[in-house]
């Protein structure tokens, strides 16, 4: 079973220092700050699922050196920052979405010996991300538009 921890209070203070190894901000309708880093030097699992996030500001994740699992399921992501994708040891849990094409391509080009990337559909079933992108995302369309959320499942 996946590890889990209790959802934090809805009123999140981004200036606070979080000491836990697991942080759960699921379903809080959060808006992530663009110019501020989450202060959580011990966190290995960060759950941001179900927050209506369209992007993952790279600065927000800059100081999370221990992060291993980032859950962004049930967010209408339109882009994933390249710097975040280049963290080869970070396991992204995300909905199957053409916006993940950049993540896939950066991992393929920069990370050796990786397990196949996965994505999740609306029934919470896992899929091989490569296969999903090949079948569901027209070649070059996601990168050309810069979004690709036209294939996002709700």
């Amino acid at each position: 079973l996946e590890p889990s921890c209790t959802v934090s209070s809805a009123d999140v203070d981004w200036n606070a220092e979080f000491s836990a190894t697991c942080l759960n901000f699921s379903g809080l309708s959060l808006s992530l700050p663009h110019n501020q880093s989450l202060r959580a030097s011990n966190v290995i699992l960060l759950d941001l699922s179900g927050n209506g996030l369209r992007e993952l500001p790279v600065t927000f994740f800059a100081h999370l050196q221990k992060l291993e699992v980032l859950n962004v399921l049930r967010n209408p992501l339109s882009r994933v920052d390249g710097a975040l994708a280049a963290r080869c040891d970070l396991d992204l849990q995300a909905d199957c979405n053409c916006a993940l094409e950049s993540w896939h391509d950066i991992r393929r080009d920069n990370c050796s010996g990786q397990k196949p990337l996965l994505c999740w559909d609306t029934t919470s079933s896992q899929h091989n991300l490569s296969a999903f992108l090949e079948v569901s995302c027209a070649p070059g369309l996601a990168s050309a538009t810069g979004s690709g959320h036209h294939h996002h499942h709700h």
Epitope: E2, S19, T21
Partner: antibody, heavy 125, light 107 residues
Framework: QVTLKESGPGILQPSQTLSLTCSFS??????????VSWIRQPSGKGLEWLAH???????RYNPSLKSRLTISKDTSSNQVFLKITSVDTADTATYYC?????????????????WGAGTTVTVSS | DVVMTQTPKSMSMSVGERVTLSCKAS??????VSWYQQKPEQSPKLLIY???NRYTGVPDRFTGSGSATDFTLTISSVQAEDLADYHC?????????FGGGTKLEIK
Amino acid sequence: QVTLKESGPGILQPSQTLSLTCSFSGFSLSTSGMGVSWIRQPSGKGLEWLAHIYWDDDKRYNPSLKSRLTISKDTSSNQVFLKITSVDTADTATYYCARRHRDYDSRGHWYFGVWGAGTTVTVSS
Amino acid sequence: DVVMTQTPKSMSMSVGERVTLSCKASENVGTYVSWYQQKPEQSPKLLIYGASNRYTGVPDRFTGSGSATDFTLTISSVQAEDLADYHCGQSYNYPFTFGGGTKLEIK
């Protein structure tokens, strides 16, 4: 095969500095997600976590002992060290080192999967 | 610090009986609890991680359950070789802490 082995002085006197070494094999402490903790156990009592060192040389200490503890590593020789200053009889215990690693099938979890056999330390005047 | 309280401190069971060990955390630790078995004169060995995941090679008579503050280790049919101390520990927050242990004796 992953193994860890602790070594120490055996006996030392109050106020001295205790120096412990954890020699390991079967993994590299430069691998992302890897780490080693020191944990001790007074005879007949429970376990007490002391300190942890990460692959990136980041360190964490038990606040109740922090001023007396120093953890360090030598990645090339596969060793982790712990120093405890100003020891007292209360520091008499078996000292263990234990490995934490990230595994694809258990990512996001934290546990000590492999422990050394322990080294017994007695503080006595 | 998170205080982990184990009950009972000791118990004596017959081979084949079902054993239930309890561990309570003073605050919510999610599923960041592990169980370790320590046989006499040996170092601890991991049995369960993430509250309910059996570690590699651990017999399936060992089962972990619980979340938040209440955790249980169950041995479905205790064997003579299960004579040991059992420790729960939390890794949700530094400093990591352990319970005082439960000593399992076999009648």
